[in-house]
C-alpha cells in the first residue's frame, strides 16, 4: 500500500460522568480511550480485508463528561437510567459528519449481558455504519448512524481489559459491515471437535468471550468478508491518509510535547492548547517541566512528581506504579509471581495480568458443567476444571473429584463471567443468564422506522 | 500478536557506545510512548530513558550520556549509549503501554 492511501478512519470519542466517575481523572479516562483505541488499530492493521491493508483509526476529538456535567442540561448523557437503545439514539442524535464513527463510553450496566450496541453498516442502501452522514428518519429526527456504544459493566462487575477491547473491535466491526458470526466455520468455539473448539470464536460472535483464547482477538473469514465490501464502497468517503497528529485530541503524539485538548476544554497551565499558533500548539510552556496530559506523574504545577508517589494501584497481579521522578509517565508494575491467585480466587496471575483459570494452578483446564439435557445448571456459574483434553473428567472445584487441590470448597465464577460455552454470562445470583445478541439492535431499527413504538425518557 | 523485539546489547569496555534498537513482531500504529527499562543483577527493573510524543526524559544515571529516539517510519525505538560505566551492566527493555515485555538485550560493561 501507498502512504497515499486512505486507510485511516477518524474516531470522536465521547465519555459519559459515569465512566468518568469509575476512572476518577481525566487523564486515567484519556489513557483508557487511547488503550481502547490501540487495541482496535491492532486487530485491524493486522488483519488483510481481502487486499485491503493497514486500516487504522485514530481520535480526532474527545468529550469527557466529568462528574460536574451529570446535571448540565446540554450533556445528554446525564441521565441515571437509561436502556442501551436509548444510549445508542442519544448518541445518534448528535451531527456526527465530521467523523468516520463516534463513540460513548460508559460504566453502565445494561440488561442482559448487553455490553455494546452499534449501527450495522452495509454496502449499498442502508443506513449505519462507517461514514453514514446525518439525514432525517422517519421519527422525524435528524440522526447520525455512524455511531456506537460500550460499556465497562457487567452483572455489576467490570470486565477485565481485554474484554472491553474485544467489545469496542465487535461493535467497529458491525459499523464496519459485520453481522454476527454463524455457521460451523464461523464459531469454531460451539465445535464438537475439542482441537476447533479450544482456539474459541472469533470477534463477530454473537454471545459472550473470555478474551483470552486464540480467535478471541481475529476476525472470522465471514467477517473479513462483509467488512471487505463495505470498505470497497465506503472507505473513500470519509477515511484520511493516516500519519497526521491531531493536536487537540488529548493524546500526545508525535511532533507533540503534550496535549490537553482545544481552549474550551485545556485545563492546564502546563501545556499550550490546540487553539495556539502553529508552533506553540501541543508544546510545554517555557520552564515547564512536563503536562498532566503526558501521564500521572506529573503535577498540577507543571514538575514531575517526586520519586515516592503512587501512579498506579496495586492489583491482583502487579505491585503498585511508583513514579521515578523524572518522567510523567507512570513506570510498569512488577508483577506479582505466576499462580497468585486473582479476581477472588476464580483466576491464577500469569506475567502480571489476571488471565488463567484457578485450574491452572494444579495443571488442570477449565471446562463448562453442563450436562447436555441441562439438568445442572445450577453449576453453570461454579468454577470446573477438567484434566488437560479429558472433558469427561470435567466437575466442579466443590466436587469430591477436586477436593485435594481445593478441598471441597464450591468456587464460583464473578458475576459477569462467561458460562454454559460462552453462551451467556453469569448474574449476581450466580445464575447463567443467556445473551440475546440481536435483540437491541432489532428494538431500535423498530424504534426509528416506526416511532410510534418507542416510549420517551422522562427527566 | 504484537511482541517486542530488543537488540544491539553487547560486551564493551567502559566509555563505549552502543545502540540498542527495538523492534516488532506484529503491526501497530500511533505508537506514542515508548520507553526503555534496565535490569541490573538482582536488581528490579527501572526505566531509564522515556520518549512521549516529542519529549524525551533521561534518569539521572544516564543523563548526557543516553539519548532515545524514534525511527518514525519503521515506527521503532532505539537507545543510543555512550560513555557507557560498568554501573550501566543489565539487560536492557523496550517497553509500550499494553504490550507485553520482550526478552531483552544483554548489556555488560567491563572495567
Known amino acids: 500500500t501507498t502512504s497515499a492511501e486512505k486507510n485511516t478512519c477518524q474516531l470522536y470519542i465521547q465519555t459519559d460522568h459515569l465512566f468518568f466517575k469509575y476512572y476518577g481523572t481525566r487523564e486515567a479516562v484519556i489513557a483508557q480511550i487511547s488503550s481502547h483505541v490501540k487495541a482496535i488499530d491492532t486487530i485491524y492493521q493486522t488483519t488483510d480485508f481481502s487486499g485491503i491493508r493497514n486500516i487504522s483509526f485514530m481520535v480526532k476529538r474527545i468529550r469527557i463528561n466529568t462528574t460536574a456535567d451529570e446535571k448540565d442540561p446540554t450533556n445528554p448523557f446525564r441521565f441515571p437510567n437509561i436502556g442501551v437503545e436509548k444510549f445508542l439514539e442519544l448518541n445518534s442524535e448528535q451531527n456526527h459528519d465530521d467523523y468516520c464513527l463516534a463513540y460513548v463510553f460508559t460504566d453502565r450496566d445494561f440488561d442482559d449481558g448487553v455490553l455494546g450496541l452499534a449501527w450495522v453498516g452495509a454496502p449499498s442502501g442502508s443506513s449505519g455504519g462507517i461514514c453514514e452522514k446525518s439525514k432525517l428518519y422517519s421519527d422525524g429526527k435528524k440522526k447520525s448512524l455512524n455511531t456506537g456504544i460500550i460499556t465497562v459493566q457487567n452483572y455489576g462487575s467490570h470486565v477485565p481489559p481485554k474484554v472491553s477491547h474485544i467489545t469496542f473491535a465487535h461493535e467497529v466491526g458491525h459499523n464496519f459491515g459485520s453481522p454476527h458470526d454463524s455457521g460451523t466455520e464461523c464459531t469454531p468455539g460451539e465445535s464438537k471437535n475439542l482441537g476447533q473448539k479450544e482456539n474459541g470464536n472469533y470477534i463477530m460472535y454473537a454471545r459472550a468471550t473470555s478474551g483470552d483464547k486464540l480467535n478471541n482477538n481475529k476476525f472470522s473469514l465471514c467477517s473479513i468478508r462483509n467488512i471487505s465490501q463495505v470498505l470497497e464502497k465506503k472507505r473513500n468517503n470519509c477515511f484520511v491518509e493516516s500519519g497526521q497528529p491531531i493536536c487537540g485530541n488529548g493524546m500526545v503524539e508525535q511532533g507533540e510535547e503534550c496535549d490537553c485538548g482545544y481552549s474550551d476544554q485545556c485545563k492546564d497551565e502546563c501545556c499550550f492548547d490546540a487553539n495556539q499558533p502553529e508552533g506553540r500548539k501541543c508544546k510545554l510552556k517555557p520552564g515547564k517541566q512536563c503536562s498532566p496530559s503526558q501521564g500521572p506523574c506529573c503535577t498540577a504545577q507543571c514538575a514531575f512528581k517526586s520519586k515516592s508517589e503512587k501512579c498506579r494501584d496495586d492489583s491482583d497481579c502487579a505491585r503498585e506504579g511508583i513514579c521515578n521522578g523524572f518522567t510523567a509517565l507512570c513506570p510498569a508494575s512488577d508483577p506479582k509471581p505466576n499462580f497468585t491467585d486473582c479476581n477472588r480466587h476464580t483466576q491464577v496471575c500469569i506475567n502480571g495480568q489476571c488471565a488463567g483459570s484457578i485450574c491452572e494452578k494444579y495443571g488442570l483446564e477449565e471446562c463448562t458443567c453442563a450436562s447436555s439435557d441441562g439438568k445442572d445448571d445450577k453449576e453453570l456459574c461454579h468454577v470446573c476444571c477438567m484434566k488437560k483434553m479429558d472433558p469427561s473428567t470435567c466437575a466442579s472445584t466443590g466436587s469430591v473429584q477436586w477436593s485435594r487441590h481445593f478441598s471441597g470448597r464450591t468456587i464460583t465464577l464473578q458475576p459477569g463471567s462467561p458460562c454454559n460455552d460462552f453462551r451467556g454470562y453469569c448474574d449476581v445470583f450466580m445464575r447463567c443468564r443467556l445473551v440475546d445478541a440481536d435483540g437491541p439492535l432489532a428494538r431500535l431499527k423498530k424504534a426509528i422506522f416506526s416511532p410510534e413504538l418507542y416510549e420517551n425518557i422522562a427527566e | 500478536e504484537v511482541q517486542l523485539v530488543e537488540s544491539g546489547g553487547g560486551l564493551v569496555q567502559a566509555g563505549g557506545s552502543l545502540r540498542l534498537s527495538c523492534g516488532r513482531s506484529?503491526?501497530?500504529?500511533?505508537?506514542?510512548?515508548m520507553s526503555w527499562y534496565r535490569q541490573a543483577p538482582g536488581k528490579t527493573r527501572d526505566m531509564v530513558a522515556a520518549i512521549i510524543g516529542d519529549a524525551t526524559n533521561y534518569a539521572d544515571s544516564v543523563k548526557g550520556r543516553f539519548t532515545i529516539s524514534r525511527d518514525n517510519a519503521k515506527n521503532a525505538v532505539s537507545l543510543h549509549m555512550n560513555r557507557l560505566k560498568p554501573e550501566d551492566t543489565g539487560v536492557y527493555y523496550c517497553?509500550?503501554?499494553?504490550?507485553?515485555w520482550g526478552q531483552g538485550t544483554q548489556v555488560t560493561v567491563s572495567s
Open positions: 506484529g503491526r501497530i500504529s500511533n505508537i506514542n510512548i
Open positions: 517497553k509500550i503501554p499494553g504490550v507485553d
